[in-house]
């Protein structure tokens, strides 16, 4: 059979080989499509309800005024010329519809390095056959389930038109120290060959590099955090990030009611100052990051400095 590809909604003419160009003609067309259960016979003198789908023209060709999904199938013509010679024509018709240009919806403006992020959802509407959606990073195809890339796909079919809507949600885990402005795009590839892929407009989210927790350093003087009664402890919160974040202080998991400062001085240490201290760095662009906790404890003269403090009171320190 000769393969014919026709666009949905467009007219199609199938020639009946060997048929006399004008009536009277001895020919018949047989259809086995989505509109038939077995073979439907159409003849030149037919004319009826099937004319809206397919009708025999005066020259013996079969005319389909607007091809639909249900017209996919086999079309056969059997014709006899004036000399009684029989000729058969056999066609396999497949239909297609190119969707509108795909779009990326719900796209992220910012991604966080080192963690999974939803980049966006690619949507293609009105295709037949369904076709496929694929994602590209800086022009190169992204392979799902490789290097922190995952894709969630959904295919829906319109109940009346039979056309497909495809959705593809892209999740990525950007590498630390990678491209700060990656370019993502999505393309639709038709299910039938010989048609170019359709590509979305690209999106370029920013990649934000979170300051790793270990980089919020809490330095204690004296080292180890053990001090004699009446001594002074200096806690310094070091954050290499620029611009400098706001630093708040915590004691035993509770925020200290002090203005932000990178240095906390505890002068004239008393029992009430004992406890676990940490600092919290808050950047304007992302959430807070807490340092490791250190224990501040009092040692009586002659004692070895402990590494863990005891429960302290509610004394407040001085900010430098």
């Amino acid at each position: 059979a000769q393969n014919i590809t026709a666009r949905i909604g467009e007219p199609l003419v199938l020639k009946c080989k060997g048929a006399p160009k004008k009536p009277p003609q001895r020919l018949e067309w047989k259809l086995n499509t989505g509109r038939t259960e077995a073979w439907k016979v159409l003849s030149p003198q037919g004319g009826g309800p099937w004319d809206s789908v397919a009708r025999v023209l005066p020259n013996g060709s079969l005319f389909l005024p607007a091809v639909g999904i249900q017209d996919e199938g086999i079309f056969r013509c059997q014709a006899m010329n004036r000399n009684g010679k029989e000729t058969k024509s056999n066609y396999r018709v497949r239909v297609y519809q190119i969707p509108g240009k795909p779009e990326i919806v719900d796209s992220a403006s910012e991604l966080t390095a080192g963690v999974p992020n939803k980049v966006g959802t690619c949507v293609s509407e009105g295709s037949y056959p369904a076709g496929t959606l694929s994602w590209h990073l800086d022009g190169k195809p992204l392979v799902p389930n490789e290097k922190g890339v995952s894709v969630k796909e959904q295919t829906r079919r319109h109940p009346e038109t039979g056309l497909f809507t495809l959705q593809s949600e892209l999740m990525v885990t950007p590498a630390r120290g990678g491209d700060p402005r990656p370019t993502f795009s999505c393309s639709f590839s038709p299910g039938l060959p010989r048609h170019r892929a359709l590509r979305t407009a690209p999106i370029q989210p920013r990649v934000w590099e979170p300051v790793p927790l270990e980089e919020v350093q809490l330095v204690v003087e004296p080292e180890g955090g053990a001090v004699a009664p009446g001594g002074t402890v200096t806690l310094t919160c070091e954050v290499p990030a620029q611009p400098s974040p706001q630093i708040h202080w915590m004691k035993d998991g509770v925020p200290l009611p002090l203005p932000p400062s990178p240095v906390l001085i505890l002068p004239e240490i008393g029992p009430q100052d004992q406890g676990t201290y940490s600092c919290v760095a808050t950047h304007s662009s992302h959430g807070p990051q807490e340092s490791r906790a250190v224990s501040i404890s009092i040692i009586e003269p002659g004692e070895e400095g402990p590494t863990a403090g005891s429960v302290g009171g509610s004394g407040l320190g001085t900010l430098a």
Epitope: R35, T36, K40, G47, G48, P49, W50, D51, S52, V53
Partner: antibody, heavy 119, light 107 residues
Framework: EVQLVESGGGLVQPGGSLRLSCAAS????????MTWVRQAPGKGLEWVAS????????YYPDSVKDRFTISRDNAKNSLYLQMNSLRAEDTAVYYC????????????WGQGTLVTVSS | DIQMTQSPSSLSASVGDRVTITCRAS??????VNWFQQKPGKAPRRLIY???NLADGVPSRFSGSRSGTDFTLTISSLQPEDFATYYC?????????FGGGTKVEIK
């Protein structure tokens, strides 16, 4: 609202003529074949004529062929039935219906208009 | 021409009854059969399209089935508003042919 409204029925003498109209609204008229169906008093339904969406092709049963003409004006969303050489047996309620091809069948009907052929 | 032989021509039934109406085509018409309901003084209303599909807004107690050239309309539990005349239609070939009708009356 999707609807069909017939008009033009009435009393006519045998041999006379009458033109029925059907006004369509609420749908894309030129996407559909259209059909006339009639129903004689106390009887069943009988197909009278069909026309394709462009108006290029018309179809009739033998009982009305050469006497009735179906036509349409897509610009006016209107369907017509010109009835000539009317006979007593043409007396019926005439319905305008959407469809008549294999894609649709007949899916929407007007309320009908009565044609009486009598002397 | 195709004949659509509809049976019975009338039947009496009670509310809640299961009612079955049949149309037999004289030749193959594929799936191209509609079923209609008509009440006195009103236009027909499509119930079933392409032999087995329920039209929009039609209660689910109505159903259509097909076996070869035999087409059946079933009302699973007859309601007071279902007392009417029912017609089948073949639209596979011209002339379009209706069945003779089945009048469903109250017993």
């Amino acid at each position: 609202e999707v609807q069909l409204v017939e008009s033009g029925g009435g009393l006519v003498q045998p041999g006379g003529s009458l033109r029925l109209s059907c006004a369509a609204s609420g749908f894309t008229f030129n996407n559909y074949w259209m059909t006339w169906v009639r129903q004689a008093p106390g009887k069943g339904l009988e197909w009278v004529a069909s026309i394709d969406n462009s108006g290029d092709n018309t179809y009739y049963p033998d009982s009305v062929k050469d006497r009735f003409t179906i036509s349409r004006d897509n610009a006016k969303n209107s369907l017509y039935l010109q009835m000539n050489s009317l006979r007593a047996e043409d007396t019926a309620v005439y319905y305008c219906a959407r469809g008549g091809d294999i894609k649709v069948g007949l899916d929407l009907w007007g309320q009908g208009t009565l044609v009486t052929v009598s002397s | 021409d195709i004949q659509m032989t509809q049976s019975p021509s009338s039947l009496s039934a009670s509310v809640g009854d299961r009612v079955t109406i049949t149309c037999r085509a004289s030749q193959d018409v594929g799936i191209y059969v509609n079923w209609f309901q008509q009440k006195p003084g009103k236009a027909p209303r499509r119930l079933i399209y392409r032999a087995t599909n329920l039209a929009d807004g039609v209660p689910s107690r109505f159903s259509g089935s097909r076996s070869g050239t035999d087409f059946t309309l079933t009302i699973s539990s007859l309601q007071p508003e279902d007392f009417a005349t029912y017609y089948c239609l073949e639209f596979d070939e011209h002339p379009l042919t209706f069945g003779g009708g089945t009048k469903v009356e109250i017993k």
